[in-house]
């Protein structure tokens, strides 16, 4: 359905078309269930709650009702050359007996999260695939995406910026089709190789996918949790190699640096995961920097000489705010032979799975 | 309707910095980005970044990103450029440009000369 | 930074004769290019956007074309107020400027 937000002189600055699933956890009193349901063809925007934008103070925002008193909100912020929806948020009624069957609860829930839904300044973002935005005990689903803010006219732009799964990417399989319904757990994030070379060759040896999980509170006290995909596309990494420390320095869409620092038990001879390091951007935040660190963990450990893996998703607890969930993990520090991993130590995760 | 209003010519001297200014006015200050350009006789025109007013954020062209500051203030629809450690090669006329949406740079500033000399 | 190769840096022409400059760009630019006109104590003017949309006010002698990485310009019918500096600009990615063309009349 196509949605549109306009301005005192009747000229579009949101334009959005797409169709939405949402797939919704909720509880009964026989125990957990799950929703799925579309966005109804008569879904329409709730024009006193969408806006342009005032000048100067507050950025453009889609409002969709439907149902039973349900809403969908788009929240879109900029910079000089590119625009995002900065913010979705669901209000679900749980009162709605025709969505919610034998909700145990009649009361109001508010999810929301931060989306990958971006593009460049005069342009539409366009994405025929799924994208998936996972919220608490809520994953929605928009698809045929074509969404603009910022318009300067009353049509979309002709240029469009694609979303990453519409992307041919020839090292990476075709996508699989689209299951019926969203699952309500986010994708995994990607998988991606990171290596750290000193004056002595590599120190570090790292394939993984990472996932934060964030706690922080929000501008109208609320606080909320979110899991952020690190998208290895719009990453870049460094380090350093030191006989003590070796350090793995990530930057993430301009806005997040997390910091891996591995250190060594010299008697034991074993490297582990010693510290993590977080600075990030929480436009929603009461504190939009969001920082952690911990320099204290033991985790990932294996042998000099050897590499730690582990299959299973492992996560690492940083402070009370914040840890980080590692998919798909093979790691070697210190001492890496020709570039390569060496002997394998699997992890009691993937030791009680076989 | 739209107008961009430079600062005045100045005389600097090699290392020092100077700052110059473009007050807009016509329409709203924090829709659009503003543009800074150069122009030299050797090098012709050069964009050196932008900077949306909206909350100052400012891409540089890769060449400037040293040498060029952008600031905006919202309350008096003002853009201001610094530029730092002036040469003779910073010696150019600078102009201020609004983008009208996808149409490019559809309007300048009357552009300020700066003449860099000992 | 995109990098835009504008050729030729100058050339002559007779009056009422065409005349086309090309621009090369490092990356397909989707069309997002654009012809600028400078002369001398004026400021630069836009005659063409989206490669090939006439600003209101411009003659039809100007036209340009192209598409990916390879776009042109040309004036036909030649007149003397043509004299100048004609610059491309993609704006595809942040903006970059061609090195100019200087166009001069025999």
């Known amino acids: 359905a196509m949605f549109m937000v306009k301005n005192g002189n009747g000229t579009a600055c949101i334009m959005a078309n797409f169709s939405a699933a949402f797939s919704v956890n909720y509880d009964t009193k026989s125990g957990p269930k799950n929703m799925t349901f579309d966005l109804p063809s008569d879904a329409t925007v709730v024009l006193n709650r969408s806006s342009c934008g005032k000048e100067n103070t507050s950025d453009p925002s889609l409002v969709i009702a439907f149902g039973r008193g349900h809403t969908l909100t788009l929240q879109f912020t900029r910079q000089a050359t590119r625009y995002s929806v900065q913010l979705m948020s669901f209000v679900y009624q749980l009162s709605d007996t025709h969505l919610f069957p034998q909700a145990s609860s009649k009361e109001i829930k508010t999810v929301e999260s931060i989306t990958d839904i971006r593009a460049d300044i005069d342009k539409k973002y366009r994405c025929v695939s799924g994208t998936q935005v996972h919220m608490n005990q809520v994953t929605v689903t928009l698809h045929d995406a074509t969404i603009q803010a910022y318009l300067s006219q009353s049509s979309f732009s002709r240029g469009e910026t694609r979303c990453e799964q519409d992307r041919p990417s020839p090292t990476t399989a075709p996508p699989a089709p689209p299951s019926p319904s969203p699952s309500p757990v986010p994708k995994s994030p990607s998988v991606d190789k990171y290596n750290v070379s000193g004056t002595n060759g590599t120190c570090l040896l790292a394939s993984m996918g990472l996932q934060l999980n964030l706690t922080y509170e929000r501008k109208d006290n609320t606080t909320v949790t979110r899991l952020l995909n690190i998208n290895p596309n719009k990453t870049s990494a460094s380090g350093s190699c030191g006989a003590h420390l070796v350090t793995l320095e990530l930057h993430s869409e301009g806005t997040t640096v997390l910091l891996f620092q591995f250190g060594m038990n010299a008697s034991s001879s074993r490297f582990f995961l010693q510290g993590i390091q977080l600075n990030t951007i929480l436009p929603d935040a009461r504190d939009p920097a969001f920082k952690a660190a911990n320099g204290s963990l033991r985790a990932l450990q294996a042998t000099v000489g050897n590499s730690y893996k582990c299959n299973a998703e492992e996560h690492v607890r940083v402070t009370k705010a914040f840890s980080v969930n590692i998919f798909k993990v093979w790691v070697q520090a210190f001492k890496v032979e020709g570039g390569q991993f060496g002997s394998v130590e699997e992890c009691l995760l993937d030791e009680n799975s076989m | 309707q739209v107008q961009l209003q430079q600062s005045g010519a100045e005389l600097v001297k090699p290392g020092a910095s100077v700052k110059m200014s473009c007050k807009a006015s016509g329409y709203i200050f924090t829709n659009y980005n503003i543009h800074w350009v150069k122009k030299s006789p050797g090098q012709g025109l050069e964009w050196i970044g932008a900077?949306?007013?909206?909350?100052?954020?400012?891409p540089y062209s890769q060449k400037f990103k040293d040498k060029a500051t952008l600031t905006a203030d919202k309350s008096s629809s003002t853009t201001y450029m610094q530029l730092s450690r002036l040469t003779s090669e910073d010696s150019a006329v600078y102009y201020c440009?609004?983008?009208?949406?996808?149409?490019?740079?559809?309007?300048w500033g009357q552009g300020t000369l700066v003449s860099v000399s000992a | 930074d995109i990098q835009m190769t504008q050729s030729p840096p100058s050339l002559s022409a007779s009056l009422g004769g065409k005349v086309t400059i090309t621009c090369k760009a490092s990356?397909?630019?989707?069309?997002?290019m654009a012809w600028y006109q400078d002369k001398p104590g004026k400021g630069p003017r836009l005659l063409i956007h989206d490669t090939s949309t006439l600003q209101p006010g411009i003659p039809s002698r100007f036209s340009g074309s192209g598409s990916g990485r390879d776009y042109s310009f040309s004036i036909s019918n030649l007149e003397p107020e043509d004299i100048a500096t004609y610059y491309c600009?993609?704006?595809?990615?942040?903006?970059?400027f061609g090195g100019g063309t200087k166009l001069e009349i025999k």
């Open positions: 600009l993609q704006y595809d990615n942040l903006w970059t």
């Open positions: 440009v609004r983008a009208n949406w996808d149409v490019a740079f559809a309007y």
């Open positions: 990356q397909d630019i989707d069309r997002y």
């Open positions: 900077i949306y007013p909206g909350n100052g954020d400012a």
